[in-house]
Interface confidence: medium
């Protein structure tokens, strides 16, 4: 074979967002018949020559960027895309509220606001069932996520996390769930308001295939991202390369 071997995939199961003291498994997947895997934590000297790393209890020190590669004969593969393992529950949960309220008429506007304390200048807003979070571009201790022209599809359970751009892999606990109810529509919402919100441990299904991809710079546009946009779109003039999250392999 000419050229380097194709890169493997690296996944965190059940999620790359891991509550402190909870288990997570990092799995490197290459083609059949691999001679040797190497899984490493970047910016550290930690590595192991195995395809699977089981972490029985997540610690702050284990949060960070990981990648893997494999060897066949004397050839090494290209490295996998980086997987960024985030420890959650490190800091107090932010508060999540809806303005003017959590019940909104179809076609109306609502703003979800996540608020925390000084020094936590980054936010991620998750809607259960969506494959990626929404990011607020502006660094501040509260973040606004406007939803313009609400539809039934916006109904559901939302949570937000806060973290510091100084320690981007150490996140807060999730906010209490906020149930957004869209009235005046016959379409079934994605989650019934009477149904109890799922516990944090089960919430990971929405993020099971996320690879967190941070940069040191936040989006420079001051306009908050409307969460009617597709999660795969970039709201940055620099394009998708500066998105914070990309779908895992």
């Amino acid at each position: 074979q000419s050229g380097p071997l194709p890169k493997p995939s690296l996944q965190a199961l059940p999620s790359s967002l891991v509550p402190l003291e909870k288990p997570v498994t990092l799995r490197c997947q290459g083609p059949p018949g691999v001679d040797l895997y190497r899984l490493e934590k970047l910016s550290s000297s930690r590595y192991q020559d195995q395809a699977v790393l089981f972490i029985p209890a997540m610690k702050r020190s284990l949060a960070g960027r990981y990648r893997c590669s494999y060897q066949n004969g004397s050839l090494w593969s290209l490295p996998s895309d980086q997987l960024e393992l985030v420890a959650t529950g490190v800091f107090a949960k932010p508060s999540l509220s809806a303005q003017p309220g959590p019940a909104v008429s179809s076609g109306g506007d609502v703003t979800l606001q996540c608020q925390t304390r000084y020094g936590f200048d980054q936010f991620a807003l998750y809607k259960e069932g969506d494959p990626a979070p929404y990011k607020n571009p502006e660094r501040w201790y509260r973040a606004s996520f406007p939803i313009i022209t609400v539809t039934a599809a916006h109904s559901g359970t939302y949570r937000c996390y806060s973290f510091s751009s100084r320690d981007p892999y150490l996140w807060s606990a999730p906010s209490d769930p906020l149930e957004l109810v869209v009235t005046g529509t016959s379409v079934t919402p994605s989650r019934l308001p009477t149904e109890p919100p799922s516990p944090v441990a089960e919430f990971s299904e929405a993020t099971a295939e996320l690879t967190v991809s941070f940069t040191n710079e936040v989006f420079t546009t001051e306009t908050s991202r409307s969460i009617t946009a597709s999660p795969k779109e970039s709201d940055s003039p620099a394009g998708p390369a500066r998105q914070y999250y990309t779908k895992g392999n």
Epitope: G119, E138, R139, E217, V218, T220, T221, E222
Partner: antibody
Framework: VMLVESGGGLVKPGGSLKLSCAAS????????MSWVRQTPEKRLEWVAT????????YYPDSVKGRFTISRDNAKNTLYLQMSSLRSADTAMYYC?????????WGQGTTLTVSS | DIVLTQSPASLAVSLGQRATISCRAS??????????MHWYQQKPGQPPKLLFY???NLESGIPARFSGSGSRTDFTLTINPVETDDVATYYC?????????FGGGTKLEIK
Amino acid sequence: VMLVESGGGLVKPGGSLKLSCAASGFTFSSYAMSWVRQTPEKRLEWVATISSGGSYTYYPDSVKGRFTISRDNAKNTLYLQMSSLRSADTAMYYCARDYGYFDYWGQGTTLTVSS
Amino acid sequence: DIVLTQSPASLAVSLGQRATISCRASESVDNYGISFMHWYQQKPGQPPKLLFYRASNLESGIPARFSGSGSRTDFTLTINPVETDDVATYYCQQSNTDPRTFGGGTKLEIK
């Protein structure tokens, strides 16, 4: 990282003044910024904060309604407009990059309020 | 407002010895087990310089002779061993509660 303050001077009580802070060496538009002052007695006091894009501002009660923080990200410049100045506002004024704590500070510019 | 009281106000230490500076908060600055207390060094004619953030996280480029510890209301900055270059005033600052406040400073001198 470099932060360079300017605009300080001698002002009479009740007067106004605008301070500037020119930033370089980092992506200015990505960071919340603050003004912190140091009195002649060497006490430090946080004065104002503005979010990275300029949408949000925050002040302690001691300057609220009298001071206005703003920024021009195209010019990489932070401002502090001060009015209704009092002798208690006499201080060295520093601009600083803000994480809740302040990881980079300018050299400061001096404001003296005196009749 | 949270009041931060530093002690002593001034401190004279022999070269090579240990310097210990205390900062006491009028109420807890902890949240979720994290202490929102920070330390700065200010040399004459210079702006403050960040030493530690969140009580014990050493800022990049600061020598390991400096250590930060404490939780809730009681925090300590330790320099061991003290060197000539450490002559400065040291300040603590909290960011757990608005408004953010600073301690009154501790002036370190060489004996």
